[in-house]
Amino acid sequence: PQIFNKSNDGFTTTRSYGTVSQIFGSSSPSPNGFITTRSYGTVCPKDWEFYQARCFFLSTSESSWNESRDFCKGKGSTLAIVNTPEKLKFLQDITDAEKYFIGLIYHREEKRWRWINNSVFNGNVTNQNQNFNCATIGLTKTFDAASCDISYRRICEKNAK
């Protein structure tokens, strides 16, 4: 079957069946704003959701990909890297019927999609177009190519404290 691999580099194909270990991000900025306890002493800022030692923020406002990236950076976070099945299911459970920018961009010179931590995305991005170099999730079960200049919602993520 097709499963996520364990090397934190997005999606891959393996020959044997298996389960997937929990994989966490490596950056650890401190949350800002009002802190609320979430689980076993870990905390996320107000309006952020806790999952597997990470905090996630889903915007209701919309902006371009660059503005979204900067918004997340300003909150001590990054656009979400959706590289485990656990994280994918969690995000499908909490995203409204809207499109959300994530941290996945097309590198035209390489002709490949990469997460913003530079790891390779080995899945398939739908709706590809020569002018669509950013990606969204939500609304559908797929990773959809999108214009980086169109305004969509965003998902930010960072380590829980």
Epitope: P1, L58, P85, K89, D93, T126, K141
Partner: antibody, heavy 116, light 113 residues
Framework: QVQLQQSGAELVRPGTSVKISCKAS????????LGWVKQRPGHGLEWIGD????????YYNENFKGRATLTADKSSTTAYMQVSSLTSEDSAVYFC?????????WGQGTLVTVSA | DIVMTQSPSSLALSVGQKVTMSCKSS????????????LAWYHQKPGQSPKLLMY???TRESGVPDRFIGSGSGTDFTLTISSVQAEDLADYFC?????????FGGGTKLEIK
């Protein structure tokens, strides 16, 4: 911890309607899809629909469209399902469950009996 | 609608034995974009609500013992219990979460000898 507490059993007449509640606690109610599932002995489990409380967006199984109505009250973190024009086929246990497509947390179920 | 078919409808085993149950879907549950199979497994103990065991065919829900193993792809899926325990007495349901309406199999009743 995540909890979904459903309202008690209902005995209702054919042709009438019933409204079941599901009180959520232990998580951000507005930010998670909440589904409803019907279980009849010998008929297995049947997905009715789901709601995103933050926006009120809903999806329905065509089999229940027009008869089932899903709503959510953000202030009380309670979701509701109303089913109208009840028949004996609607006698079942109804569950609320958190999630968009697969469900990790379930209410304890509400038994609805439709009888004259 | 996608039809889910489970087999066998019931089985009885002794504690420690290996259990295998099947679930077949009327169309592929494989998502080409994210490379996951949208198939979940639940068990439901007598008088209780269903409990999620597995999603994406092979990803164990948090807290589920590792004796539960999900496998398969496309239309054919299997839930294996490597060494059945007395507390595993339950009805087991598969569910496709690929497209609406999400549909469930008829269930496999596991009895302990």
């Amino acid at each position: 911890q995540v909890q979904l507490q459903q309202s008690g059993a209902e005995l209702v007449r054919p042709g009438t309607s019933v409204k079941i509640s599901c009180k959520a606690s232990g998580y951000g109610f507005n930010n998670y899809w909440l589904g409803w599932v019907k279980q009849r002995p010998g008929h297995g489990l049947e997905w009715i629909g789901d709601i995103y409380p933050g926006s009120g967006n809903t999806y329905y199984n065509e089999n229940f469209k027009g008869r089932a109505t899903l709503t959510a009250d953000k202030s009380s973190t309670t979701a509701y399902m109303q089913v109208s024009s009840l028949t004996s086929e609607d006698s079942a246990v109804y569950f609320c469950a958190r999630g968009k497509e697969s469900f990790a947390y379930w209410g304890q179920g509400t038994l609805v009996t439709v009888s004259a | 609608d996608i039809v889910m078919t489970q087999s066998p409808s019931s089985l009885a085993l002794s504690v420690g034995q290996k259990v295998t149950m099947s679930c077949k879907s009327s169309q592929s549950l494989f998502n080409f974009s994210n490379r996951n199979n949208y198939l979940a497994w639940y068990h439901q103990k007598p008088g209780q609500s269903p409990k999620l065991l597995m999603y994406f065919a092979s990803t164990r829900e948090s807290g589920v013992p590792d004796r539960f193993i999900g496998s398969g792809s496309g239309t054919d899926f299997t839930l294996t219990i490597s060494s059945v325990q007395a507390e595993d007495l339950a009805d087991y349901f598969c569910q496709q979460h690929f497209t609406t309406p999400y549909t469930f199999g008829g269930g496999t009743k596991l009895e302990i000898k």
